[in-house]
């Protein structure tokens, strides 16, 4: 079964500052959670207006997933829990098409990095997606930020078109993903 979210545009508009936006459009008030007050709008298909959608308001649809680009700063673990509260998970990149879509989105925010759902307990143990699936470096390489001062960057974020490891405690933005099935 598929959840259908309905939203009515124009009932409430957000004050400037709720979104880091490339334009000054008004967006419908998110009704799902206060966590959704901090999302990045995009030119991609958004679930605003009167429509039936498999995604909640202000999430972006791409192929078979909904994406939320959260603009609240959090550690990796805090970001993971934030996504969980919204019934989703931190981003899992499954294909080169999806990677291209994500890069296109985050490249419009060149000053910001976004946590994704890849972590490990320590450097001797392989990277693991949040759902427990294995990471394959065939899809992308993780560029290390390890130094003598910070030897254990065990979480992963994306910055513009590059994916880096990073200390899990560093506050950053994040990308939540909610897969749907038709």
């Amino acid at each position: 079964t598929m959840a259908i979210w309905r939203s009515n545009s124009g009932s409430n508009t957000l004050e400037n500052g709720y979104f880091l936006s490339r334009n000054k459009e008004n967006h419908s008030q998110p009704t799902q959670s206060s966590l959704e007050d901090s999302v990045t709008p995009t030119k991609a298909v958004k679930t605003t207006g009167v429509l039936s959608s498999p995604c909640p308001p202000n999430w972006i649809i791409y192929e078979k997933s909904c994406y939320l680009f959260s603009m609240s700063l959090n550690s990796w673990d805090g970001s993971k829990r934030q996504c969980w509260q919204l019934g989703s998970n931190l981003l899992k990149i499954d294909s080169s098409n999806e990677l291209g879509f994500i890069v296109k989105q985050v490249s419009s925010q060149p000053d910001n990095s976004f946590w994704i759902g890849l972590s490990r307990p320590q450097t001797e143990v392989p990277w693991l997606w949040e759902d427990g699936s294995t990471f394959s470096s065939n899809l992308f390489q993780i560029r290390t930020t390890a130094t003598q001062e910070n030897p254990s960057p065990n979480c992963v974020w994306i910055h513009v078109s590059v994916i880096y490891d990073q200390l899990c405690s560093v506050p950053s933005y994040s990308i939540c993903e909610k897969k749907f099935s038709m």
Partner: antibody, heavy 118, light 107 residues
Framework: QVQLVQSGAEVKKPGASVKVSCKSS????????IHWVRQAPGQGLEWMGW????????NYAQKFQGRITMTRDTSISTAYLELSRLRSDDTAVFYC???????????WGQGTLVTVSS | DIQMTQSPSSVSASVGDRVTITCRAS??????LAWYQQKPGKAPKLLIF???SLQSGVPSRFSGSGSGTDFTLTVSSLQPEDFATYYC?????????FGPGTKVDIE
């Protein structure tokens, strides 16, 4: 739904080898590590190692190095555990388990009892 | 290897009781800890992963907490089907290791 089905019970003599199979269904076999865990009668759980079904890479607990082999056949979504040079204290139930979040074991086979006795 | 210890080794309790089991790691493991329930003759069942995340389908009376070296599994109101043995497991470093188990039986 995710299912792991293991091969049946085995009785082996000391010094012999045993090969246990674990057939997966309900998910993409190559996406998740398969772990092997054993439990001696009345005892606790002991992690033996894992295999990455996609690459075939393995990681074995040091205790079993030299007499353990984990393999897989992706065409039939099946993982195998082979333990050689069996001793009486290898008598145990052997479980396969599929990896889940944070390297936990979210789905388990029903277990295979291997009895080593002369 | 990281050693995992559990206390108590066994506990007698009644239906409706609140039961707490502790697990201690010999070195810090952050939140890379899971809890399992096992009944005689059955495979273990995952209850908690990542120290505090409830596995899908597991009743909310089960909860986990802790980080570093000290962890707790709590059953808020024990039900008849909860009488079993509980194991913790660390996934911070190889080899992954389990605690010796805590048996919860009927008082």
């Amino acid at each position: 739904q995710v299912q792991l089905v293991q091969s049946g019970a085995e009785v082996k003599k000391p010094g012999a080898s045993v090969k246990v199979s674990c057939k997966s269904s309900g998910y993409t076999f190559t996406d998740y590590y398969i772990h092997w865990v054993r439990q001696a009668p009345g005892q606790g759980l002991e992690w033996m190692g894992w295999i990455n079904p996609n690459s075939g890479d393995t990681n074995y607990a040091q205790k079993f190095q030299g007499r353990i082999t984990m393999t897989r056949d992706t065409s039939i979504s099946t993982a195998y555990l082979e333990l050689s040079r069996l001793r009486s204290d290898d008598t145990a139930v052997f479980y396969c388990a599929r990896n889940s979040g944070s390297y936990s074991f979210g789905y388990w086979g029903q277990g295979t009892l291997v009895t080593v006795s002369s | 290897d990281i050693q995992m210890t559990q206390s108590p080794s066994s506990v007698s309790a009644s239906v409706g009781d609140r039961v707490t089991i502790t697990c201690r790691a010999s070195q810090g493991i952050s939140s890379w800890l899971a809890w399992y329930q096992q009944k005689p003759g059955k495979a273990p069942k995952l209850l908690i992963f990542g120290a505090s995340s409830l596995q899908s389908g597991v009743p909310s009376r089960f909860s986990g907490s802790g980080s570093g070296t000290d962890f707790t599994l709590t059953v808020s109101s024990l039900q008849p089907e909860d009488f079993a043995t509980y194991y913790c497991q660390q996934a911070f470093s190889f080899p992954f290791t389990f605690g010796p188990g805590t048996k919860v039986d009927i008082e």
